[in-house]
């Protein structure tokens, strides 16, 4: 009897676990190519897809091109960024280039925004060259408000690779605050 | 004020070379990239080369690849363009052009070049 009882309060805890950890907000974006800025200058990236492909969101919203908080608490934030040239792509108008991503926290409460992360250098991708690549990786740590909005903003958008293993973005909710 | 003069077109024999020059003035001519285009009697204005600012990357039309070579002098403020084993076809008023705008890629479209020489007359004929 004491060994089925543990069995059933071990599946109930489990159950409980699974309910608690389903609910725990997270997001995965992935870029919507069809609609990339194009210019040199840095742009906010509104276009991506949370429901497609490797793209999921749970009690997360996503709208307007910024992933908003539901619920407070702690979040891992990250985003990975790949730019890439290939001759046929086009004329590259200049070899210099800064390959930048920042990712930012909008407040609507109190207006305002940050930076939470940037990443990025500055490169020299010589037009006459076939093929050039590089990738930009960021993630940290955040204490996040309900209602808090994340962009994602980069430097040259018309280098971006449009693949969804390529170009995403994410959060997930590891504990409440205190 | 932005101004581009060309220099250096005439009259050629199939298979002759020539050197066009462009003098440019009234911008900070290093920043940015230029470009020949060219233009035949009654037809399109079309691309014939670009190079940017720094004249690291050059880019050519298929028709004139391996013949002509574009190139810049930062300090003179000049662009170039050699002309070799020219042909009949390459018969066209030559221009060359400033692309200002803040884009990653360059145009080909001569309509996306905000300024531009009165051009020079090339002719390949014998």
């Known amino acids: 009897i004491r060994a089925e009882k543990a069995m059933v309060d071990g599946s109930w805890l489990d159950l409980a676990k699974r309910s608690k950890l389903e609910a725990q907000p997270f997001a995965h974006l992935t870029i919507n190519a069809t609609n990339i800025p194009t210019g040199s200058h840095k742009v906010s990236l509104s276009s991506w897809y949370h429901d497609r492909g490797w793209a999921k969101i749970s009690n997360m919203t996503f709208s307007n091109g910024k992933l908003i908080v539901n619920q407070d608490g702690f979040y891992y934030l990250y985003a990975n960024i790949c730019f890439r040239h290939h001759e046929t792509s086009g004329d590259l108008a200049t070899e210099y280039l800064q390959l930048m991503v920042y990712v930012t926290k909008t407040s609507i409460k109190i207006p305002s925004s940050h930076t939470l992360m940037k990443g990025g250098s500055t490169k020299y991708w010589s037009g006459n060259s076939e093929f050039h690549f590089y990738s930009i990786n960021v993630g940290g740590f955040f204490k996040l408000r309900s209602g808090e909005e994340i962009s994602v903003e980069v430097s040259n958008p018309s280098l971006l690779d449009p693949d969804q293993d390529a170009t995403y973005f994410g959060a997930f909710k590891v504990r409440d605050i205190d | 004020e932005v101004q581009l003069v060309e220099s250096g077109g005439g009259l050629v024999q199939p298979g002759g070379s020539l050197r066009l020059s462009c003098a440019a003035s009234?911008?900070?001519?290093?920043?940015?990239?230029m470009g020949w285009f060219r233009q035949a009697p009654g037809k399109g204005r079309e691309f014939v080369s670009s190079?940017?600012?720094?004249?690291?990357?050059?880019y050519y039309a298929d028709s004139v690849k391996g013949r002509f070579t574009i190139s810049r002098d930062n300090a003179k403020n000049t662009l170039y363009l050699q002309m070799n084993s020219l042909r009949p076809e390459d018969t066209a008023v030559y221009y060359c052009?400033?692309?200002?705008?803040?884009?990653?890629?360059?145009?080909?479209?001569?309509?996306?070049?905000?300024?531009w020489g009165q051009g020079t007359l090339v002719t390949v004929s014998s």
């Open positions: 052009a400033a692309y200002i705008r803040p884009d990653t890629y360059l145009s080909r479209d001569y309509r996306k070049y905000d300024y």
């Open positions: 009234g911008f900070t001519f290093s920043s940015y990239p």
């Open positions: 190079i940017t600012g720094s004249g690291g990357s050059t």
